[in-house]
Interface confidence: low
């Protein structure tokens, strides 16, 4: 006999990295027929939504009107159909950016290299942080961590054309509070045509994801949850 439902999917729109004071929507997708969704933050209940009609809705949205360090952290969601609860979703790490200062990103030996050359990125920030993050723009949004008092190095090793793309770095004040992004550095890796065709650059995010990051969320997402209007708020699992 099945004791739990499959776990829902959780993600942030438009992105998990949210500049402070900007808007973000946390989405939780479960099953049609789910009568209740709970969003949990750092282990305690954060919000509840009851879709109407449940049989026609399989996704709910929790709107955060202006992001700050208080809202940054780990989120998960669960849903129930009747009395049966789902497994919890994977954890969503929601990060607040544009905190305090802007790091400087540089690349050695330079932004234009040939395939096989060793490349190292350097991220520098003079204020109190010891963790740095290097991100390559693209759908995968791969994050590398580096450590250092005021500067971290990110050796990429011998590069291929797959390393081509735009990079930025952040200083991290804690796991979920990052600095302003550095100015972008575009790495151009030249190589033979065959390699290039085998390893195309990651598809990039829409233009608003970097720099401005966020466009105004549709007013339809700014729904009035009236969070005090439910009894399940103290049914923490």
């Amino acid at each position: 006999q099945q004791q739990t439902l499959p776990k829902p999917f959780i993600w942030a729109e438009p992105h998990f990295m949210v500049p402070k004071e900007k808007q973000v929507t946390i989405c939780c997708q479960g099953n049609y027929g789910a009568v209740e969704y709970q969003l949990h933050f750092e282990g305690s209940l954060f919000a509840v939504d009851r879709p109407k009609p449940p049989e026609r809705i399989n996704k709910v949205q929790f709107y955060i009107p202006d992001m700050n360090s208080r809202m940054a952290g780990q989120y998960s969601c669960i849903y129930r159909v009747g009395e049966l609860w789902s497994e919890p979703s994977n954890l969503l790490d929601l990060v607040v950016t544009e905190m305090y200062d802007t790091p400087t990103l540089s690349v050695h030996p330079g932004p234009e290299v040939i395939s096989g050359e060793k490349v190292t990125f350097y991220c520098r920030l003079d204020t109190a942080t010891s963790m740095f993050l290097l991100l390559k723009e693209g759908r995968s949004s791969h994050v590398q961590r580096g450590y250092g008092k005021v500067q971290a190095e990110f050796p990429l090793g011998p590069v291929t054309t797959a390393h081509r793309g735009t990079y930025r770095c952040f200083g991290s004040y804690n796991n979920h509070a990052w600095s302003f992004p550095s100015e972008p550095v575009k790495l151009l890796v030249t190589g033979d045509i065959e390699n290039t065709s085998l390893a195309p650059e990651d598809p990039t995010f829409p233009a608003d994801t970097w720099g401005t990051y966020l466009l105004t969320t549709e007013t339809g997402l700014q729904k009035d949850h009236a969070l005090w209007d439910h009894t399940a708020q103290n049914l923490l699992r």
Epitope: E42, S44, Q222, L227, Q233, N234
Partner: antibody, heavy 117, light 107 residues
Framework: EVQLVESGGGLVQPGGSLRLSCAAS????????MNWVRQAPGKGLEWVSY????????YYADSVKGRFTISRDNSKNTLYLQMNSLRAEDTAVYYC??????????WGQGTLVTVSS | DIQMTQSPSSLSASVGDRVTITCRAS??????LAWYQQKPGKAPKLLIY???RLESGVPSRFSGSGSGTDFTLTISSLQPEDFATYYC?????????FGQGTKVEIK
């Protein structure tokens, strides 16, 4: 910078009425649930009333239910508390407070309501 | 309603002292507890929420701990500006309820 500024307090006789206002600035007012919290002289904090972002849902402490009405005008970024049938035990400093998931992250400076004959 | 009980109701301490205030809930509230500081004639100020998360801009000498029914606010090294009244508040269910307060006075 988030700012909440209360006004409308004063001296009123038992059975009288008073309307408090709270002018909000520095944040998207309509997106936030708001509350009134009061503090009798020399006493602790007591939650009074809650209103959702749209104004569609309101809640009251048992001690004021039926006498107080919370409302908001999102076009004016203003929160209100209409207090009727006032009693001596309603004497307090009234704070408007922004709520974020059940705790109060920003408070106004408070306005004193004195109910006395 | 969930009842919140703070202890002690007042305490005297010196600058540099480590100060601990406790708060007990009448039923389990997970980690849904906030702490506020209030100085005479001023509005309360949020210090800690979710039992242990420090509000932005609050000095790191303040810390919170606990889960379930028993919670603690600790000031690791009391500073002159810390003499005030401290309140706990459960943000687990409605109505939100406060402890009766703990006044921290200069010894």
């Amino acid at each position: 910078e988030v700012q909440l500024v209360e006004s409308g307090g004063g001296l009123v006789q038992p059975g009288g009425s008073l309307r408090l206002s709270c002018a909000a600035s520095g944040f998207t007012f309509s997106s936030y649930e708001m509350n009134w919290v009061r503090q009798a002289p020399g006493k602790g904090l007591e939650w009074v009333s809650y209103i959702s972002g749209s104004g569609g849902s309101t809640y009251y402490a048992d001690s004021v239910k039926g006498r107080f009405t919370i409302s908001r005008d999102n076009s004016k970024n203003t929160l209100y508390l209409q207090m009727n049938s006032l009693r001596a035990e309603d004497t307090a400093v009234y704070y408007c407070a922004r709520v974020w998931r059940f705790y109060f992250d920003y408070w106004g400076q408070g306005t004193l309501v004195t109910v006395s004959s | 309603d969930i009842q919140m009980t703070q202890s002690p109701s007042s305490l005297s301490a010196s600058v540099g002292d480590r100060v601990t205030i406790t708060c007990r809930a009448s039923q389990g509230i997970s980690n849904a507890l906030a702490w506020y500081q209030q100085k005479p004639g001023k509005a309360p100020k949020l210090l800690i929420y979710a039992a242990s998360r420090l509000e932005s801009g609050v000095p790191s000498r303040f810390s919170g701990s606990g889960s379930g029914t028993d919670f603690t606010l600790t000031i690791s090294s009391l500073q002159p500006e810390d003499f005030a009244t401290y309140y706990c508040q459960q943000h687990y269910s409605t109505p939100p309820t406060f402890g009766q307060g703990t006044k921290v006075e200069i010894k």
